[in-house]
């Protein structure tokens, strides 16, 4: 059974992941981003189901495409390099989903824009955090 300290650690990691995802979204989805129109042409795979930490496998598999799109963003929008940002997210995702069990991600039929993709995973984090508090 999860202890209160492990629950607290999970909560903190999710909060960190949430802030990172929100920071990326804020950097992209604003009217001063000169690359927004181009970025919105890239398609991302969405999870068919995202209700448990193991479903973060679906996020992990899309981190490389996410980094590639972020490389389009001007440095004014991102003071962190995309590689560093994605690396930070990857570390948190790996810790949260655990590496013991192998989970095969199932994707929805419809692809999504980067904004829809980030909003989906932001909602996921908020939802899991609310069950922990």
């Amino acid at each position: 059974a999860p202890t209160s300290s492990s629950t607290k650690k999970t909560q903190l990691q999710l909060e960190h992941l949430l802030l990172d995802l929100q920071m990326i979204l804020n950097g992209i989805n604003n009217y001063k981003n000169p690359k927004l129109t181009r970025m919105l042409t890239f398609k991302f795979y969405m999870p068919k189901k995202a209700t448990e930490l193991k479903h973060l496998q679906c996020l992990e598999e899309e981190l490389k495409p996410l980094e590639e799109v972020l490389n389009l963003a001007q440095s004014k929008n991102f003071h962190l390099r995309p590689r560093d940002l994605i690396s930070n997210i990857n570390v948190i995702v790996l810790e949260l989903k655990g590496s013991e069990t192998t989970f095969m991600c199932e994707y929805a039929d419809e692809t999504a824009t980067i904004v829809e993709f980030l909003n989906r995973w932001i909602t996921f984090c908020q939802s899991i955090i609310s069950t922990l508090t």
């Epitope: 979204l25 804020n26 989805n29 001063k32």
Partner: antibody, heavy 122, light 111 residues
């Protein structure tokens, strides 16, 4: 002094069109992104659209996308809003507001016009 | 869209007394450039909005120092240290971190 003056409002029937103008003076117009923000009677503020300082990009709220078009003429220091297929829910005071695009201060929408009233009614 | 929620929606105040308005965003307003694009506007009856505070706590030029802004992340506050008669009207918080959205407004009136 710095001034934004809107014009072109009036009473129009649903489905018809209207073109609003915003005349800018007292500052370098081409350095500023320009917004339209509206306020329905007795309601709060709603962002409508923005155009970049050089006119290269424009964005719209979902509620007006495909019906409204923002444009500007930097040689005449004027901003426009072409409103087509007007609906009753577009009834509002329409304000233009400037936002510095090139400076470092990031004031946001620091100067607003007095507004022009658009009434959509049959 | 980012949803901005203001409390209270109405605030009857006594002249010379302090007033405080809260604003909460549905998600963090911090951009990766380190800035938080949260502004406060004041609108008197029949007038256009006027910028008071930008980037959480910076007073715009000509704004009296009785106005101050604070907060971080998703929670923000506008304080008036001593309310004057000219301060009546509606106050809006506004975010431009993403596409602009406004709070519902807080009506400040004299008791």
């Amino acid at each position: 002094q710095v001034q934004l003056v809107e014009s072109g409002g009036g009473v129009v029937q649903p489905g018809r069109s209207l073109r609003l103008s915003c005349a800018a003076s007292g500052f370098t117009f081409s350095n500023y992104g320009m917004h339209w923000v509206r306020q329905a009677p007795g309601k709060g503020l709603e962002w409508v659209t923005v155009i970049w300082n050089d006119g290269s990009n424009e964005y719209y709220a979902d509620s007006v996308k495909g019906r409204f078009t923002i444009s500007r003429d930097n040689s005449k220091n004027t901003l426009f809003l072409q409103m087509n297929s007007l609906r009753a829910e577009d009834t509002a005071v329409y304000y233009c507001a400037r936002e510095d695009w090139l400076g470092e201060a990031d004031y946001g929408m620091d100067v607003w016009g007095q507004g022009t009233t658009v009434t959509v009614s049959s | 869209d980012i949803v901005m929620t203001q409390t209270p929606l109405s605030s009857p105040v006594t002249l010379g007394q302090p007033a405080s308005i809260s604003c909460r965003s549905s998600q963090s307003l911090v951009r990766s450039d380190g800035n938080t694009y949260l502004s406060w506007l004041h609108q008197r009856p029949g007038q256009p909005p006027r910028l008071l505070i930008y980037k959480i706590s910076n007073r715009f030029s000509g704004v009296p120092d009785r106005f101050s802004g604070s907060g971080a992340g998703t929670d923000f506050t506008l304080k008036i240290s001593r309310v004057e008669a000219e301060d009546v009207g509606v106050y809006y918080c506004m975010q431009t971190t993403q596409f602009p959205t406004f709070g519902q407004g807080t009506k400040v009136e004299i008791k």
